[in-house]
């Protein structure tokens, strides 16, 4: 049996997909089915993640990399590496302990996940409400009332109608 690797630390050259037992002469062993080692020199192979139930397989496990899961339709991932699946709600709703509930007046959610958030308070920025908010959409803030006075520069002011005999101020 021939090994083609260098003679330094015996474990360092055990490739990904194998594990190393430095108590034995024959050092590298292949990972058994449904296990993996993603780096060389590992002392054990890790059991592949299984995407079951509400999880579905996004990427199959291999001897050198773990499986990756996502969520079945109607659910979305939460946490690092999709460690949890949470039920989707409709836009305009949020998930509570009792299921999906419509956003209260004055709040909105434009996604299938997350919580309802308060509409933007346009007046805090000295602006006025251009488009009213809904359960699914935030308000759209427009220019402040002062911005709409004649002569003031504004993002989208309509051109003031001129009265005969008057010149622009």
């Amino acid at each position: 049996f021939e090994r083609t690797r260098s003679l330094q630390d015996p474990c360092s050259n055990c490739p990904a997909g194998t594990f190393c037992d430095n108590n034995r002469n024959q050092i590298c062993s292949p990972c058994p089915p449904n296990s993996f080692s993603s780096a060389g020199g590992q002392r054990t192979c890790d059991i592949c993640r299984q995407c079951k139930g509400v999880f579905r397989t996004r990427k199959e496990c291999s001897s050198t990399s773990n499986a990756e899961c996502d969520c079945t339709p109607g659910f979305h991932c939460l946490g690092a590496g999709c460690s949890m699946c949470e039920q989707d709600c409709k836009q305009g709703q949020e998930l509570t302990k009792k299921g999906c509930k419509d956003c209260c007046f004055g709040t909105f959610n434009d996604q299938k996940r997350g919580i309802c958030r308060p509409w933007t308070n346009c007046s805090l920025d000295g602006k006025s409400v251009l488009v009213n908010g809904t359960k699914e959409r935030d308000v759209v803030c427009g220019p402040s009332p002062a911005d709409l006075s004649p002569g003031a520069s504004s993002v989208t002011p309509p051109a003031p109608a001129r009265e005969p005999g008057h010149s622009p101020q």
Epitope: G17, Q26, P30, P32, S62
Partner: antibody
């Protein structure tokens, strides 16, 4: 669906050379080490060679050391076995298998005879 | 190298019988033993890995046990399609080695 398809077998005279190929599909070939295993007619299974996923680590059985060379082309999802100085005792069905040894191809038959 | 020895070489039985196949390793191989089924003209098929884990799609009548040097494959109730040669193999260390096989045939 995982598939491994061997090709390249045939009749060769003693001392001759041949290259076997294994075409892989249905899985991420570049993430798996690969084996060649052979089976002489009416006999048991004999492991021949292993190559790691990236090709950096290679092991051979003593019976083929110095005569056979295992290699792979991850861009082509292909595994190879170059066989030189062939002997009658190399006559066998040659299988490729993933390093989990869970999926095997259907094999390609090598016959070494004069 | 690690030598895997299977017994018996041949087993004659009737459908519905319980059958136990034996595999012994020449040295400790932990639980790194797999069992394969091979029918005439076909490639080997993985049944059991890690001594006792049934591979995907393998019927529940197949089970494996053992660790160290002694391993067993049990078929709880043999079906006609189970008639084949069964090999054990170790992946504890290179070179990977296999037993000589046990042939299951009809009485």
């Amino acid at each position: 669906e995982v598939q491994l398809v061997e090709s390249g077998g045939g009749l060769v005279q003693p001392g001759g050379s041949l290259r076997l190929s294994c075409a892989a599909s249905g899985f991420t070939f570049s993430e798996f080490g690969m084996h060649w295993v052979r089976q002489a007619p009416g006999k048991g299974l004999e492991w021949v060679a292993y190559i790691s996923s990236g090709g950096s680590t290679i092991y051979y059985a003593d019976s083929v050391k110095g005569r056979f060379t295992i290699s792979r082309d991850n861009a082509k999802n292909s595994l190879y076995l170059q066989m030189n100085s062939l002997r009658a005792e190399d006559t066998a069905m040659y299988y490729c298998a993933r390093d989990w040894v869970d999926y095997w191809g259907q094999g390609t038959l090598l016959t070494v005879s004069s | 190298e690690i030598v895997m020895t299977q017994s018996p070489a041949t087993l004659s039985l009737s459908p519905g019988e319980r059958v136990t196949l034996s595999c012994k390793a020449s040295e400790n191989v932990g639980s790194y033993v797999s069992w394969y089924q091979q029918k005439p003209g076909q490639a080997p098929r993985l049944l059991i890995y890690g001594a006792s884990n049934r591979y995907t799609g393998v019927p529940a009548r197949f089970s494996g046990s053992g660790s160290g040097t002694d391993f067993t494959l049990t078929i709880s109730s043999v079906e006609p399609e189970d008639l084949a040669v069964y090999y054990c193999g170790q992946s504890y260390s290179y070179p990977l080695t296999f037993g000589g096989g046990t042939k299951l045939e009809l009485k």
